[in-house]
Interface confidence: medium
């Protein structure tokens, strides 16, 4: 089945992140202005910003929300994300990307310094 | 060949719980992302949730509570239980996989055939 770009829904838009920890970013959007209604869930990707050839992360959840924590991500790290709206044959272009850093990991306890 | 086939469906009870098995053949399960939906009568398609290559589940927030997505890598199989079902939960139950967007926008991909769920007394 190919389905025709007409019918596919419009990338979602507004997307953007919010540094929540040094291991989670908030994300959220605004549902797709066109064919939203046939949305069956949206595709969060993510990956790290710097170097070559890193691995790209996907997690898909469902039409009911526009936001997402992704919680499981490295310390004072560049994350580049970008959503996708899924339909039952088909999938909307990508939205656009936004690149959003964690924060640094914090120690539990300050150093010990012996003199 | 590339095959989905869900097994399970059937009359439950309200307050009852199912239990779905989807078997894969021709690609492998657990190196994909896995998902079930669902299509009540007269109504569109429903994302229930999925399970990815690394074995973490995510579920639709609403059916979050009673629903587990699970995997039995050596049978290639992926299941779905659902527990305090109500008349609402009945629909025809499908497991599909939904490829990375890398793969391209435009992909017809694997749908199994569905398995009919009614809950009823």
């Known amino acids: 089945t190919v389905v025709m770009s007409e019918d596919r829904p419009s990338a979602p838009y507004n997307v953007h992140a919010e540094t929540m920890s040094s291991s989670a970013i908030l994300l959220a959007w605004e549902r797709p202005l066109y064919n939203s209604d046939k949305v069956i869930a949206y595709s969060v990707h993510y990956m790290k910003a710097e170097g070559l050839n890193n691995e790209e992360y996907q997690v898909v959840i469902g039409n009911d929300t526009t936001h997402y924590i992704i919680d499981d991500l490295e310390p004072a790290s560049n994350y580049t994300f970008y959503i996708v709206a899924y339909m039952p044959m088909g999938a909307s272009q990508m939205s656009d990307h936004v690149t959003q850093n964690t924060l640094e990991d914090v120690p539990l306890r300050p150093p010990e310094i012996s003199l | 060949e590339v095959q989905l086939v869900e097994s399970g469906g059937g009359l439950v009870q309200p307050g009852g719980s199912l239990r779905l098995s989807c078997k894969a053949s021709?690609?492998?399960?657990?190196?994909?992302?896995m998902h079930w939906v669902r299509q009540a009568p007269g109504k569109g398609l429903e994302w229930i949730g999925g399970?990815?290559?690394?074995?973490?589940?995510n579920y639709k927030s609403s059916l979050k509570s009673r629903v587990t997505i699970s995997r039995d890598n050596s049978k290639n199989t992926l299941y779905l239980q659902m527990n305090s079902l109500r008349a609402e939960d009945t629909a025809v139950y499908y497991c599909?996989?939904?490829?990375?967007?890398?793969?391209?926008?435009?992909?017809?991909?694997?749908w199994g055939q569905g398995t009919l769920v009614t809950v009823s007394s």
């Open positions: 599909a996989r939904l490829p990375p967007s890398r793969d391209g926008y435009n992909y017809a991909d694997y």
């Open positions: 021709g690609f492998t399960v657990s190196s994909n992302y």
């Open positions: 399970i990815n290559h690394s074995g973490r589940t």
